[in-house]
């Protein structure tokens, strides 16, 4: 193949690959017709003048995962056909000015995972056809104005995993064709107003894992084509009312891991394409009416691991397509009976790890398609009569780790659970907390005999059986939402003497090993 160096492999398709620790310089002679050259995992420490002079047809050059720390300015001379150049995963601290001069066809330049301390406008001034520039994983502390001014065709710019503490509002102003901008894992504390105004074609903006505390109200107002906005793991404590108002194409928004304390009504919207909204790990304490009302197509709403203690009855208005609602690990004590009324398509609701002490009888009244309900680790003592009767698709119900009060009032629930045991899972079953003499006994096993001295023996109402569908898919624990409202008495008062008999054959009921939470 026109003279392949012994340290390399050359294919008929004009592809050359040179790998191995024994290589300490660019191998020679390289086949003159090579179109793709890869130099990987070698001990090359520097590139001298014109090592690729005789392979002017080269289209792709990958020099990755080497010990490369120094490059002579003329190293890439005579590579006018080169479209793809990767110098990723080396030890470069400095780029010589003029290094990319003459690379008139270059479309992709990968400089990621080096030790670059700075870039200058002169570095990329010759790269007018560049479409992709990868600078992530370096040690850049600032980007000077003009650094990207000549890259008018750029569509993808990755500056993630650097040490940027601030961004000039002018640095991206000429990048009208940019579609992807990644600034994740830096040390940005704020983004100046106007920074993204020139990015009219931007589709993805990644700002996660910075230290951003405040978002300017009009920060995204010119980014009408934005589809993915990542703001998670910052220090954002509040959202300006209009900050998301001009993002009609948005289909992914992450805000988890911030310090949000409240969400104002209409803050999200209109976003007809948004399918998922991740708000876990914030400090949200309440949800007002209509806070999500513009998110008509939302299917997943994750609000777990906040401090939510109050949910307004109309908080979930408009979420007619919602499939999964996660409210677990909050501080909910009460839920209004109508709070989930609009969620006609809800399949999975997570309310575990809250402080719910009771649930209203109509809490799931209009949510007929529920398949999974997580209610474990609350403070429920009983549940209202018939609360699950209409949930024909329910195949997973988690009720363990609640302080169930196993007096005569528990009979309807106990009877329903007996008939619907497969839904409860096998590893953990609900156990009684009170009275003390039955503490720890399975709520399903326990036998409550009600002795009535009078001739008239009232019929004990039981939860009607809901058939269990074994072919319905089982959903894993996801997230939880919790809150309660008025306590609906599950059965009529029993004034008679109650005696409780207990069976202790726990192994029959799968109580040998508790499932970890």
């Amino acid at each position: 193949y026109h003279g392949c160096p012994s340290e390399c492999t050359c294919s008929r398709a004009s592809q050359v690959e040179c790998t191995g620790a024994r290589i300490v310089a660019v191998p020679t002679p390289l086949p003159w017709n090579a179109m793709s050259l890869q130099i990987l995992n070698t001990h090359i420490t520097e590139l001298n003048e014109s090592p690729f002079l005789n392979i002017s047809a080269l289209i792709a050059l990958r020099i990755e995962k080497n010990e490369l720390s120094r490059i002579t300015p003329g190293a890439f001379r005579n590579l006018g056909s080169l479209r793809y150049l990767s110098l990723a995963n080396n030890k470069l601290q400095v780029l010589p000015i003029g290094l990319f001069q003459g690379l008139d066809s270059l479309e992709s330049l990968l400089l990621s995972s080096n030790q670059l301390l700075q870039i200058q406008p002169a570095h990329f001034s010759q790269c007018s056809n560049l479409k992709e520039l990868q600078l992530h994983g370096n040690h850049l502390e600032y980007i000077p104005d003009g650094a990207f001014d000549h890259l008018v065709g750029l569509t993808k710019l990755n500056l993630g995993k650097n040490s940027l503490t601030h961004i000039s509002p002018r640095v991206f102003q000429h990048l009208g064709n940019l579609q992807v901008l990644r600034l994740y894992e830096n040390r940005l504390t704020d983004i100046p107003m106007g920074t993204f105004d020139g990015l009219v074609n931007l589709q993805e903006l990644a700002l996660q894992q910075n230290q951003i505390g405040l978002l300017s109200p009009g920060l995204f107002h010119n980014n009408h084509n934005l589809q993915r906005l990542y703001l998670s793991n910052n220090h954002i404590s509040q959202l300006p009312p209009s900050v998301f108002m001009q993002l009609p194409q948005l289909n992914r928004l992450t805000l988890f891991g911030n310090s949000l304390k409240e969400l104002s009504p209409g803050i999200f919207g209109p976003m007809p394409n948004l399918r998922e909204l991740w708000l876990y790990d914030n400090h949200i304490s309440s949800l007002p009416d209509n806070v999500f009302s513009n998110l008509r197509q939302l299917q997943v709403l994750i609000l777990s691991r906040n401090q939510i203690s109050f949910i307004s009855p109309g908080a979930f208005n408009g979420l007619t397509e919602l499939r999964e609602l996660s409210l677990h690990t909050n501080a909910l004590q009460d839920l209004d009976g109508n709070v989930f009324r609009m969620l006609a398509n809800l399949q999975n609701i997570s309310l575990q790890n809250n402080r719910l002490r009771q649930l209203p009888g109509n809490i799931f009244a209009n949510v007929n398609g529920l398949m999974a309900i997580q209610l474990q680790n609350n403070q429920l003592e009983n549940l209202p009569l018939g609360i699950f009767d209409h949930l024909g698709k329910l195949c997973e119900l988690r009720l363990y780790d609640n302080p169930w009060r196993c007096d005569s009032d528990i009979l309807p629930l106990r009877n329903w659970l007996l008939l619907n045991q497969p839904r409860l899972g096998t590893d953990t079953v609900p156990v009684c907390f009170s009275p003390a003499n039955v503490r720890g006994q399975s709520l399903i096993i326990i036998n409550v005999n009600v002795a009535v001295p009078s001739v008239h023996v009232p019929e004990v109402p039981s939860y009607p059986e809901t058939p269990w569908y074994p072919d319905t898919p089982s959903y894993p624990d996801t997230t939880s939402v919790s809150s309660t409202t008025e306590l609906t008495s599950p059965v009529e008062d029993y004034t008679d003497l109650t005696t409780i008999q207990v069976t202790d054959d726990r192994s029959v009921w799968g109580m040998t090993q508790a499932q970890s939470g």
Partner: antibody, heavy 120, light 112 residues
């Protein structure tokens, strides 16, 4: 007879981790929750967390990132794992349960405690 | 988190006299549906583990002498020892469980 016995305390270097055990007898961990509470010398009580019968856990929010409570039902043992220890974690560590009380978060049976000292 | 503030820090009372300890919560501990105040009182004698005395603000734990009583609702609570005995010398703690538990700073009761 209900008993809770803590072990695993001792001297730990700052930045290190500890794993305390609470061996219980007289009741089953599949039926009762177990809390961890600590008390620095001459100071007040601080609730750390709880593991319930079914394995769910709750933690003190200020310590959550450094705490893990787990258990082995078959061994009748509950564990407290704490990472990134600092001098302020020096304390007596107790485990406790709700044996008779009607208060779900009440702690009416306590161990005698195990002392943890964080110092270089 | 709910902050529990006890007063006084220490209290010296003559044998047979009444001792009163106050506990104030930063948030109401009354659940309007269950109509319970989620407040408990613990006693810790020198060198011993704590002991649960009272829960739901006023319900005495079984075996606790009736000289101990709890009162209050919402954010203000009181533990009263109607006739102090020598064996009551201890530190007393209030604890809320409306949210995840937090203890008060403690009140030391001594004999005058």
């Amino acid at each position: 007879e209900v008993q809770l016995v803590e072990s695993g305390g001792g001297l730990v270097q700052p930045g290190g981790s500890l794993r305390l055990s609470c061996a219980v007898s007289g009741f089953s961990l599949t039926s009762y929750g177990v809390h961890w509470v600590r008390q620095a010398t001459g100071k007040g009580l601080e609730w750390l967390g709880v593991i319930w019968a079914g394995g769910s856990t709750n933690y003190n929010s200020a310590l959550m990132s450094r705490l893990t409570i787990s258990k082995e039902n078959a061994k009748s043992s509950v564990y407290l794992q704490m990472n990134s220890l600092r001098a302020g974690d020096t304390a007596m560590y107790y485990c406790a349960t709700h044996m008779i009380t009607e208060d779900y978060y009440g702690m009416d049976y306590w161990g005698q405690g195990t002392t943890v000292t964080v110092s270089s | 988190d709910i902050v529990m503030t006890q007063s006084p820090d220490s209290l010296a009372v003559s044998l047979g006299e009444r001792a009163t300890i106050n506990c104030k919560s930063s948030h109401s501990l009354l659940n309007s549906r269950t109509r319970k105040n989620y407040l408990a009182w613990y006693q810790q004698k020198p060198g011993q583990s704590p002991k649960l005395l009272i829960y739901w603000a006023s319900t005495r734990e079984s075996g606790v002498p009736d000289r101990f009583s709890g009162s209050g609702s919402g954010t203000d609570f009181t533990l009263t020892i109607s006739s102090l005995q020598a064996e009551d010398v201890a530190v007393y703690y209030c604890k809320q469980s409306y949210n995840l538990p937090t203890f008060g700073g403690g009140t030391k009761v001594e004999i005058k």
